[in-house]
Interface confidence: medium
Amino acid sequence: MKVLQEPTCVSDYMSISTCEWKMNGPTNCSTELRLLYQLVFLLSEAHTCIPENNGGAGCVCHLLMDDVVSADNYTLDLWAGQQLLWKGSFKPSEHVKPRAPGNLTVHTNVSDTLLLTWSNPYPPDNYLYNHLTYAVNIWSENDPADFRIYNVTYLEPSLRIAASTLKSGISYRARVRAWAQCYNTTWSEWSPSTKWHNSYREPFEQH
């Protein structure tokens, strides 16, 4: 039993880091493997993560961590019984993938403006709370070509767009994701999408 692709890990910079790797053949990750992780700090304890299968030879482990700070560094040991298969280290602050925003809502009752709001996935005491920017994806269910991205570079988790920038009388979906420039993070996963029917009064055309 050997590691084919070594573990790569990302942190949500709050309480969970996720590590994924591939073995050289089909593996029952939860029964055959254990990922031990330990904060490099005096008196810190080693913790054990029981991996789950992620495809035939793939494994994924969700490491529970206390509040993360930028200096934190973890050692990782992947064991198959008494056999050490791989060892490495992981600095959560250097591999951040933010949590996905939640509660995406489309408010259609503000004259001819669409107001999209969502929730910041972090509590106010988390460093990322004030450092997230967002991308909002809106697309038409009827027309695959009608696909647009709005970059929200201010901190407020909301976006206003004129309803008239979208076609009237058809259904649209929206989703949102986040990233933080300060830690050069990857993008979060997309939030669950929300659907609405876009309708607005066409301006009266004069001839």
Epitope: K2, V3, L4, Q5, E6, N24, V40, T75, L84, L85, W86, K87, S89
Partner: antibody, heavy 122, light 107 residues
């Protein structure tokens, strides 16, 4: 019994290239990481490079980074060290060594070859 | 990169003496350290792996110890065949690094 036999050493001029080979037997070659270690005349041991079992994870000493390339051919039970832009300070006895683990550097080396001499001189 | 500082660089001792060699790592390496013995004109042989574990076939007079970033190799009763040069090796992370070596000579 682990057997590692190095070859390819010799006298070469500065700036030229040389390729070392290591033929392995007596163990399942693709179960283990492998290393190259060198020893200059009258000096101590210096780790040069290492490669994991399937050749995707590589490591190099700063002194050879960008000049040397480690590789392996598991079908041929062989380890290689391509040495380019050789310098006088690369003159040394080069050992091929077997690791105890499969992925780069678990427990250090537990088997060594007899070595091959590389002399870089004009 | 992790530096390994080995001391002493040489020592003279008699058969039956207790000998201790020390290696200090420039940063934490857990127990990722091995000890090797090399005789003139020969390839190195592993004595200890993972700081304290005796390699198969190595006499029990050899032992390894660790305290923080300081590692020791102890020969409890020096034998004639033990006169050689000893090296530590950190295998915690690339690039791997050896200590400078300790030459154990006959007094």
């Amino acid at each position: 019994e682990v057997q590692l036999v190095e070859s390819g050493g010799g006298l070469v001029q500065p700036g030229r290239s040389l390729r070392l080979s290591c033929a392995a037997s007596g163990f399942t070659f693709d179960d283990y990481a492998m290393h190259w270690v060198r020893q200059a005349p009258g000096k101590g041991l210096e780790w040069v490079s290492g490669v994991n079992w399937n050749g995707v994870s590589l490591g190099y000493a700063d002194s050879v980074k960008g000049r040397f390339t480690i590789s392996r051919d598991n079908a041929k039970n062989s380890l290689y060290l391509q040495m380019n832009s050789l310098r006088a300070e690369d003159t040394a006895f080069y050992y091929c060594a077997k690791d105890s683990g499969s992925y780069h550097y678990y427990y250090g080396m537990d088997g060594w070859g007899q070595g091959t001499t590389v002399t870089v001189s004009s | 990169d992790i530096q390994m500082t080995q001391s002493p660089s040489s020592l003279s001792a008699s058969v039956g003496d207790r000998v201790t060699i020390t290696c200090r790592a420039s940063q934490g390496i857990r127990n990722d350290l091995g000890w090797y013995q090399q005789k003139p004109g020969k390839d190195p042989k592993r004595l200890i792996f993972a700081a304290t574990n005796l390699h198969g076939g190595v006499p029990s007079r050899f032992s390894g110890g660790v305290s923080g970033t300081e590692f020791t190799l102890t020969i409890s009763s020096l034998q004639p065949e033990d006169f050689a040069t000893y090296y530590c090796l950190q295998h915690n992370s690339y690039p791997l690094t050896f200590g400078g070596g300790t030459k154990v000579e006959i007094k």
